[in-house]
Interface confidence: medium
């Protein structure tokens, strides 16, 4: 028997449901009761969910995963897996024993979006070109670890005294906060660009100092 | 390379019990089958049953229901095939033995060393 | 249970000849098949698989055909090496099930 899944990640949303496919080719008069299909965890063979003497045996994960039992017969030995979470994140192996038996893994990448950055600016009055400035750029609630970028109103990179750090909430999302400290010119305008690499996402916010007043 | 390595050689009273140990090494326990075959002296060989461990679930010879039990514990990766109410024509060497990573469930590339358990009055 | 019959039960040769043992099955098995080498005091090995599939490291003059009910493992220069018990298995149902043996021993 040959396993087929698929070579690239399959990403998903938190809190979206996932498909982890996986196919092989029944023989001729193949029965359900021949088949034992075993989805695990690659690395610690911990049990997901199987299939074995002619019945589902449920889920062993969470009771969030779920085979398509009337597309068992055709080779469709694919898993659901539902309202995914970041500790879904890993490779998944799909077993499939007939008489002989073959094995494919398949990795699940979780993703979720950056929320649109919210800036502050501190000191944020009485500010006159030539003064040291500290704007936080923040983003919430992504996945995985974000990509930041400042730029300045010319597009340019801003590379200098940017410290960035991302803290995982108990979901397991990131809340980003990245702080460029700069010296003001006679105007200007700081941007931040928060990047999500998995979903190839940009989140931009930007401050532009006129002066007096500011915008954001 | 997968290496079975069953507990030593045993003699039991007939009607008695007897459980035999197979610890498996150097390749993947959990997801693979291990079945007990065993071998009169003489004979030919006779297929007992088999477990797969990452599931729980065991399968017996028609012929052995009833007396013949085979477990596994992940942890230690080993494999036990407890026999009862044996009787002298129970007296074989007991194989445990599996496909490993690359063959079957059901044919056996690796095989233990031989557990000889003579049941005797 | 399936039922496994091989002959011949023994078979007397020389170095050099070639071998046939045969395997029959009491009703079909497609190509579910293996064939073990055991010499005594051992345990058996494995040779061939879903009939005739080498298994790795087995020297090629082994060779095994056949598929439905009848089967046939091939030695085509038996070497001194060779002596030995022959079984078959059938893994076409859950429950497994061996032939009688044929041994193979020097003329």
């Known amino acids: 028997v040959e396993v087929q899944v698929s070579e690239d990640p399959v990403v998903a949303l938190v809190d979206t449901d996932a498909t982890l496919r996986c196919s092989f080719s029944p023989e001729p008069g193949f029965s359900l009761r021949q088949l034992n299909l075993i989805w695990q965890l690659t690395d610690t063979k911990q049990l997901v969910h199987s299939f074995t003497e002619g019945r589902d045996q449920g889920s062993a994960y969470a009771n969030r995963t779920a085979l398509f039992p009337d597309l068992l017969v055709q080779g469709n030995a694919s898993l659901r897996l539902q309202r995914v979470r970041v500790t879904d994140e890993g490779s998944y192996t799909c077993f499939v024993s007939i008489q002989d038996f073959d094995s494919a893994a398949v990795s699940l990448q979780v993703a979720a979006p950056y929320s649109k950055p919210s800036m502050t600016l501190e000191p944020n009055k009485d500010l006159r070109p030539g003064d040291m400035v500290t704007i936080t750029c923040s983003s919430y609630q992504g996945y995985p670890e974000a990509e930041v970028f400042w730029k300045d109103g010319q597009g340019l990179p801003l590379t200098g005294n940017v410290t960035t750090s991302q803290m995982a909430n108990e979901r397991g999302l990131f809340d980003v906060h990245s702080v460029l400290r700069v010296v003001l010119g006679a105007n200007g305008t700081y941007s931040c660009l928060v990047r999500n690499p998995v979903l190839q996402q940009d989140a931009h916010g930007s401050v532009t100092i006129t002066g007096q007043p500011m915008t954001f | 390379q997968v290496q079975l390595v069953e507990s030593g050689a045993e003699v039991k009273k007939p009607g008695s019990s007897v459980k035999v140990s197979c610890k498996a090494s150097g390749g993947t326990f959990s997801s693979y089958a291990i079945s007990w075959v065993r071998q009169a002296p003489g004979q030919g060989l006779e297929w007992m049953g088999r477990?797969?461990?990452?599931?729980?679930?065991?399968n017996y010879a028609q012929k052995f229901q009833g007396r013949v039990t085979i477990t596994a514990d992940k942890s230690t990766s080993t494999a036990y095939m407890e026999l009862s109410s044996l009787r002298s024509e129970d007296t074989a060497v007991y194989y445990c033995?599996?496909?490993?990573?690359?063959?079957?469930?059901?044919?056996?590339?690796?095989w233990g060393q031989g557990t000889l358990i003579t049941v005797s009055s | 249970d399936i039922q496994m019959t091989q002959s011949p039960s023994t078979l007397s040769a020389s170095v050099g000849d070639r071998v046939n043992i045969t395997c029959r099955a009491s009703?079909?098995?497609?190509?579910?098949l293996a064939w073990y080498q055991q010499k005594p005091g051992k345990a058996p090995k494995l040779l061939i698989y879903k009939a005739s599939y080498l298994q790795t490291g087995v020297p090629s003059r082994f060779s095994g055909s056949g598929a439905g009910t009848e089967f046939t493992l091939t030695i085509s220069s038996l070497q001194p090496d060779d002596f030995a018990t022959y079984y078959c298995q059938q893994y076409n149902s859950y429950s497994l099930t061996f032939g009688g043996g044929t041994k193979v021993e020097i003329k």
């Open positions: 477990i797969i461990p990452i599931l729980g679930i065991a």
């Open positions: 009703q079909t098995i497609n190509s579910w």
């Open positions: 033995a599996n496909g490993g990573d690359s063959s079957s469930w059901y044919t056996f590339d690796y």
